[in-house]
Amino acid sequence: EEELQVIQPDKSVLVAAGETATLRCTATSLIPVGPIQWFRGAGPGRELIYNQKEGHFPRVTTVSDLTKRNNMDFSIRIGNITPADAGTYYCVKFRKGSPDDVEFKSGAGTELSVRAKPSAPVVSGPAARATPQHTVSFTCESHGFSPRDITLKWFKNGNELSDFQTNVDPVGESVSYSIHSTAKVVLTREDVHSQVICEVAHVTLQGDPLRGTANLSETIRVPPTLEVTQQPVRAENQVNVTCQVRKFYPQRLQLTWLENGNVSRTETASTVTENKDGTYNWMSWLLVNVSAHRDDVKLTCQVEHDGQPAVSKSHDLKVSAHPKEQGSNTAAENTGSNERNIY
């Protein structure tokens, strides 16, 4: 009878993570008597996967009944495959012996490759907000995929971006891989409602790419424009001055009125109106009792937005000659939270 050969018919097997891998092995003869063992890898550091004779291998099942003498099919199934299971598996025939069985012949090996899906891409933006016209960086990360080939694209509001750099690690062979990409995005005043999208395509996703998003509302700061105007006289000795704070984002804003450089009132933006582009408008007004002033008054609307250095706009209030009335030093009644009398 011809000498036993160990046949592993599959040079490679590709399995999706979580599925079962079947590793095929047959012998051409029933002699010599002795067990079959399966190993991952070769040489002294090889890892025992299954031993026909003894041991507990909960993930491994045999395709046929290996207890029988007449069996020549030593194929096994390995359940719940993970990327860590990738490698070359050898079916090895031993000859019965003492004190140990003697390795007799090995199969040529079957390379198990594991297809593992990438994790959901995580997009993160800069730690601090930035203003329009500035360029900010976004990063996208996805992990645990195999094989290594992967495609990553960036979009802003559906428009593909071109200014990005991508790395897949590690460079050499590995059981699974990670991708890291950094994209540069120029902010505009209209970006409060904008989204940056990182899209990852991989063979395991069957043409349905994974997406990670970042809202530019978390990144952008649109500084306000200020306009101070004097309204028509409400009463003979009162002037209404308004400060229009327009097109700002985020909402966090504090406004201080100064009269000739002295703090008159400070308030926080509360009842704001939202523009279509996502920015906010707010208005504060001041009721000025001009009869209390002999000289012109410089009114300043000072705004501190989102913890940034204050910006201000001033208005010179002309005090024309007029008779001083009795009780002019008496405070006029406040008619609203945004009103202030100066006397």
């Epitope: 009878e1 003869s29 029933l30 002699i31 008597v33 002795g34 067990p35 026909q52 004779k53 003894e54 290996l66 207890t67 029988k68 003498r69 007449n70 069996n71 019965k96 012996g97 003492s98 004190p99 140990d100 069985d101």
Partner: antibody, heavy 118, light 107 residues
Framework: EVQLVESGGGLVQPGGSLRLSCAAS????????MHWVRQTTGKGLEWVSV???????YYAGSVKGRFTISRENAKSSLYLQMNSLRAGDTAVYYC????????????WGQGTMVTVSS | DIQMTQSPSSLSASVGDRVTITCRAS??????LAWFQQKPGKAPKSLIY???SLQSGVPSKFSGSGSGTDFTLTISSLQPEDFATYYC?????????FGQGTKLEIK
């Protein structure tokens, strides 16, 4: 049903010959090593001989040169030709199948009695 | 030849008892050890192979352990049908050899 049935035992004079047969059924006979084991009255078991799948043979020292094991796969039959019989060969002879992957015996026949006496 | 020595030669026990029979080989036999049960006038019955693997159809009250030269057969809860003679056998190399047997008797 897997079965082994021995036959051919009997009374024989010292120096005589006897041929034992073992008829196998219920399995692919050619795929198994087959053994003969004997048991003397009131004594323990003694392995006698084996014939492998490829026809290779081995014998216990006490029977070497006197006994010959053979098989006929087409008939699913195992044989033991016993020559130059001695009184010490008196025993119940069993055939057994090396049915496990490691050639452990899994199936035994019911036995046939061989008596060597003058 | 490899010598197989069983102990004890005989053992008295009661129904429900747990009993252990030991078998020692004169040299390392890896774990190629089998156990057989034989009742008077009957052929031996295979119980265990490769030290601890149960033959098909053998109840799990029988268990085997050991390696190298020292082996044991344990019957966890004796039933009337378990009173018999038990043999160990090495089959790592020819000639295969048996122990002299342990007769398990009812107390």
């Amino acid at each position: 049903e897997v079965q082994l049935v021995e036959s051919g035992g009997g009374l024989v004079q010292p120096g005589g010959s006897l041929r034992l047969s073992c008829a196998a059924s219920g399995f692919t006979f050619s795929s198994y090593d087959m053994h003969w084991v004997r048991q003397t009255t009131g004594k323990g078991l003694e392995w006698v001989s084996v014939i492998g799948i490829a026809g290779d043979t081995y014998y216990a020292g006490s029977v070497k040169g006197r006994f010959t094991i053979s098989r006929e796969n087409a008939k699913s039959s195992l044989y033991l030709q016993m020559n130059s019989l001695r009184a010490g060969d008196t025993a119940v002879y069993y055939c057994a199948r090396g049915g496990n992957w490691d050639d452990a015996f899994d199936i035994w026949g019911q036995g046939t009695m061989v008596t060597v006496s003058s | 030849d490899i010598q197989m020595t069983q102990s004890p030669s005989s053992l008295s026990a009661s129904v429900g008892d747990r009993v252990t029979i030991t078998c020692r080989a004169s040299q390392d036999i890896n774990n190629y050890l089998a156990w057989f049960q034989q009742k008077p006038g009957k052929a031996p019955k295979s119980l265990i192979y490769t030290t601890s693997s149960l033959q098909s159809g053998v109840p799990s009250k029988f268990s085997g352990s050991g390696s190298g030269t020292d082996f044991t057969l344990t019957i966890s809860s004796l039933q009337p049908e378990d009173f018999a003679t038990y043999y160990c056998q090495q089959y790592v190399s020819y000639p295969y050899t048996f122990g002299q047997g342990t007769k398990l008797e009812i107390k």
